[in-house]
Interface confidence: medium
């Protein structure tokens, strides 16, 4: 189970919204807080360790997940071509 603790949005730049979200999750052993279908979720800890972010299925149904080459996060590409980038910190 997970709950969103903070959600900050910055829409000051045209055509671009920067959102910072923090979630708190109570996960079983071997799991850790992550993102599934664009929502906070408990995921296999090995995914986080190896930075194989797309294995969490972080994008919405119908979107394509793409790992950033430096493994700092992932992108979700909508059918229309719009790309949403998520970085992990």
């Amino acid at each position: 189970t997970c709950e969103i603790v903070t959600l900050d949005r910055d829409s000051s730049q045209p055509r671009r919204t920067i959102a910072r979200q923090t979630a708190r999750c109570a996960c079983r052993k071997g799991q850790i807080a992550g993102t599934t279908r664009a929502r906070p979720a408990c995921v296999d800890a090995r995914i986080i360790k190896t930075k194989q972010w797309c294995d969490m299925l972080p994008c919405l149904e119908g979107e394509g997940c793409d790992l950033l080459i430096n493994r700092s996060g992932w992108t979700c590409t909508q059918p229309g071509g719009r790309i949403k980038t998520t970085t992990v910190s």
Epitope: R46, K49, T50, K51, Q52, C54, G64, C65, D66, L67, L68, I69, N70, R71, T75, T77, I83
Partner: antibody
Framework: VTLDESGGGLQTPGGALSLVCKAS????????MGWVRQAPGKGLEWVGV????????SYGSAVKGRATISRDNGQSTVRLQLNNLRAEDTGTYFC???????????????WGHGTEVIVSS | ALTQPSSVSANPGETVKITCSGG??????YGWYQQKSPSSAPLTVI????KRPSDIPSRFSGSKSGSTHTLTITGVQAEDEAVYFC??????????????FGAGTTLTVL
């Protein structure tokens, strides 16, 4: 899965080359792609990679600043452009496909036949 | 850089083990690539530690113990004679994650 490279041949030092890899037999847009090269009589050397959408790239230290990798998902092609050519760029250039949608030097599951590049005056 | 023996040899039917150590990204595992001649393209025999492409015989397997990865060929055959390269990733603040390969191990089938 088939990867066909083209564009190699004799090149002039200081010049530029453009290699193209044409992919078939798989859903091209679902996989990250890369380039690996091999100098004559030497081992394999990482050139660079591009993610599925083409929005993100990474390059090996030997070509960083001189190389550009791009892709056209509609045409199922990936291109390597290398500028300011040097004699040490001579070798066979292989196109490589990542498995499970990621590409690292541990996850290549298909290789092209290679295209030979000779940099000489 | 990755360290692997420069050469190994075996008789047909024997079991061959080729080791690879080093690299900076053990989480992504190791891959093994076979090259039968300097002018031919590499062939993936193992990727992601222990995954084997469907067209690769089951005598090829990969395993990992600590920071050392081993390619095992059980019942080596004459056609397995080749150079085997291991591959992994290394991280540098300058280039980020960059692929790295071992210098290659020449397998001779006696």
């Amino acid at each position: 899965v088939t990867l066909d490279e083209s564009g190699g041949g004799l090149q002039t030092p200081g010049g530029a080359l453009s290699l193209v890899c044409k992919a078939s037999g798989f859903t091209f847009s679902s996989y990250q792609m890369g380039w690996v090269r091999q100098a004559p009589g030497k081992g394999l050397e990482w050139v660079g990679v591009i993610n599925k959408s083409g929005s993100d790239t990474s390059y090996g230290s030997a070509v960083k600043g001189r190389a550009t990798i791009s892709r056209d998902n509609g045409q199922s092609t990936v291109r390597l452009q290398l500028n300011n050519l040097r004699a040490e760029d001579t070798g066979t250039y292989f196109c490589a496909k990542g498995s499970a949608s990621y590409i690292t030097a541990a996850t290549i599951d298909a290789w092209g036949h290679g295209t030979e590049v000779i940099v000489s005056s | 850089a990755l360290t692997q023996p420069s050469s190994v040899s075996a008789n047909p039917g024997e079991t061959v083990k080729i080791t690879c150590s080093g690299g900076g990204s053990s989480g992504y595992g190791y891959g093994w690539y076979q090259q039968k001649s300097p002018s031919s393209a590499p062939l993936t025999v193992i990727y992601w530690n222990d995954k084997r492409p469907s067209d690769i015989p089951s005598r090829f397997s990969g395993s990992k113990s600590g920071s050392t990865h081993t390619l095992t060929i059980t019942g080596v055959q004459a056609e397995d004679e080749a150079v085997y390269f291991c591959g992994n990733d290394d991280y540098s603040s300058d280039s980020g994650y960059v692929g790295v390969f071992g210098a290659g191990t020449t397998l001779t089938v006696l």
